[in-house]
Interface confidence: low
């Protein structure tokens, strides 16, 4: 039984580390109160209200973040890794995940992505946590609960709905976002489209559905005519800055 609350996400702040290393019982998820949605800052949030988000690996962070120990002097408990904002082009890096979408790490510097730069399989291996429900009904061999995958660079970028590991796998105008326990290419949001804001305070439900971020020049804000609605059902839409 999957007794989970499906929570959507706009800025793609991915799953919190699974409890007990295996997400509890097979097919179960960390539950939060029904109807409780994340609200609060997204990729445009200011440092004042930013809540550090603990992580164990890059895949648990948003597409515009990577997982690392905060530098000395930064807020955060010693030894704990948190999701940090990705590094823009020409900034220093140690691995691809540190660079913002559309960039990769070459010779310690974030460079614009160009498929000719990527020999097949150069991107580091990504771990996908498979929180299975029931049995894994594979046509052929069974698959382990935790699968290590070498991230493939496709000659053809992923179209809407196709599987991806990170946003650079997706065609222009799409980002890589979680859908159930997978990640698929979804459209970057346009003006007026529904988005989801994150609080990251205390709520640790599994984010089974995610939305892309709002497109350039847009921010995820509460819809004007929904102020009367209860907090849990307020709609946010992508609006001009």
């Amino acid at each position: 039984t999957l007794n989970s609350v499906l929570i959507n996400s706009n800025a793609i702040k991915n799953l919190p580390p699974p409890l007990g290393g295996a997400g509890g019982q097979p097919g179960s998820a960390v539950s939060v109160a029904p109807g409780v949605l994340y609200e609060g800052g997204n990729k445009y949030q200011t440092l004042d209200n930013y809540q550090p988000y603990p992580c164990a690996e890059d895949e648990e962070c948003g597409s515009d973040e990577y997982c690392s120990s905060p530098s000395r002097g930064a807020a955060g408990v010693g030894g704990v890794q948190i999701c940090l904002a990705c590094r823009k082009r020409r900034k220093r890096c140690m691995r691809h995940a540190m660079c913002c979408p559309g960039n990769y790490c070459k010779n310690g510097i974030c460079m614009p992505s160009d498929h000719s730069h990527f020999p097949r399989g150069e991107i580091e291996e990504s771990i996908i946590e498979n929180l299975g429900n029931d049995h894994n009904a594979a046509a052929g061999d069974g698959y382990p609960r935790r699968t290590t995958l070498t991230s493939k660079i496709y000659h053809t970028k992923g179209q809407e709905g196709s599987v991806c590991l990170r946003s650079s796998d997706c065609a222009a105008g799409l980002c890589c976002a979680r859908h159930f326990w997978s990640k698929i290419c979804k459209p970057v949001l346009k003006e007026g489209q529904v988005c989801t804001k994150h609080k990251r305070k205390g709520s640790h439900g599994l984010e089974i559905f995610q939305r892309c971020y709002c497109g350039e020049g847009l921010a995820c804000r509460i819809q004007k005519d929904h102020h009367q609605a209860s907090n849990s059902s307020r709609l946010h839409t992508c609006q001009r800055h």
Partner: antibody, heavy 118, light 112 residues
Framework: QVQLVESGGGLVQPGGSLRLSCAAS????????MSWVRQAPGKGLEWVSS??????????WYAAGVKGRFTISRDNSKNTLYLQMNSLRAEDTAVYYC?????????WGQGTLVTVSS | DIALTQPASVSGSPGQSITISCTGT?????????VSWYQQHPGKAPKLMIY???NRPSGVSNRFSGSKSGNTASLTISGLQAEDEADYYC???????????FGGGTKLTVLG
């Protein structure tokens, strides 16, 4: 273009078994998770089961009413989705649709009719 | 066992606008800002018209729009045309055993 063609439907007695197939073409089958949705005669749509792609370990999902009786599987080499239906009941009578679940059910087959009757 | 409630039928004249409602609970439609709408003509397969509350897949007319407030989602069809006559189903996600839930369907009749 995306095409999904179901087959394997027919008349079966209560308690019997049937295996539905769905042949997919026009897209990279292995990159999408796939679903079965059914529709009883004159009734609404009901989600039955879903299976993810290889990268997610072929995780399977079932509606409560079919869990333990139905098994979803896929053969990526044949671009085919399957639904093995055992211990069939009269209430399983429906048109069974195979659907690609990209962003929600974005492409559907034309359906295959399963009739469970004695 | 219908999880989402829709009116059995609605009707409108060509050129008019109609709205179909879809009501759920905080455990399904009200809990998540994810609602899809499907159109189904008699004897045909369903077709995705709206996803994520108000997004249209490519190829779907901009006469179709979606919205949501609280536990209720709505599909609005403006400038009604004869070919819009069909059954319409809402769909959302849910906590608990059934992860995908549909509405009971609404038959849209275009008068005249």
């Amino acid at each position: 273009q995306v095409q999904l063609v179901e087959s394997g439907g027919g008349l079966v007695q209560p308690g019997g078994s049937l295996r539905l197939s769905c042949a997919a073409s026009g897209f990279t089958f292995s990159s999408y998770w796939m679903s079965w949705v059914r529709q009883a005669p004159g009734k609404g749509l009901e989600w039955v089961s879903s299976i993810e792609h290889k990268d997610a370990g072929y995780t399977t999902w079932y509606a409560a009413g079919v869990k333990g009786r139905f098994t979803i599987s896929r053969d990526n080499s044949k671009n085919t989705l399957y639904l093995q239906m055992n211990s069939l009941r009269a209430e399983d009578t429906a048109v069974y649709y195979c659907a690609r679940h990209g962003i929600d059910f974005d492409h559907w087959g034309q359906g295959t009719l399963v009739t469970v009757s004695s | 066992d219908i999880a989402l409630t829709q009116p059995a039928s609605v009707s409108g004249s060509p050129g008019q606008s109609i709205t179909i409602s879809c009501t759920g609970t905080s455990s399904d439609l009200g809990g998540y800002n994810y609602v899809s709408w499907y159109q189904q003509h008699p004897g045909k397969a369903p077709k995705l018209m709206i996803y994520d509350v108000n997004n249209r897949p490519s190829g779907v007319s901009n006469r179709f729009s979606g919205s949501k407030s609280g536990n209720t989602a709505s599909l609005t069809i403006s400038g009604l045309q004869a070919e819009d006559e069909a059954d319409y189903y809402c769909q959302s996600y849910a906590s608990g055993n059934t992860k995908v839930v549909f509405g009971g369907g609404t038959k849209l009749t275009v008068l005249g």
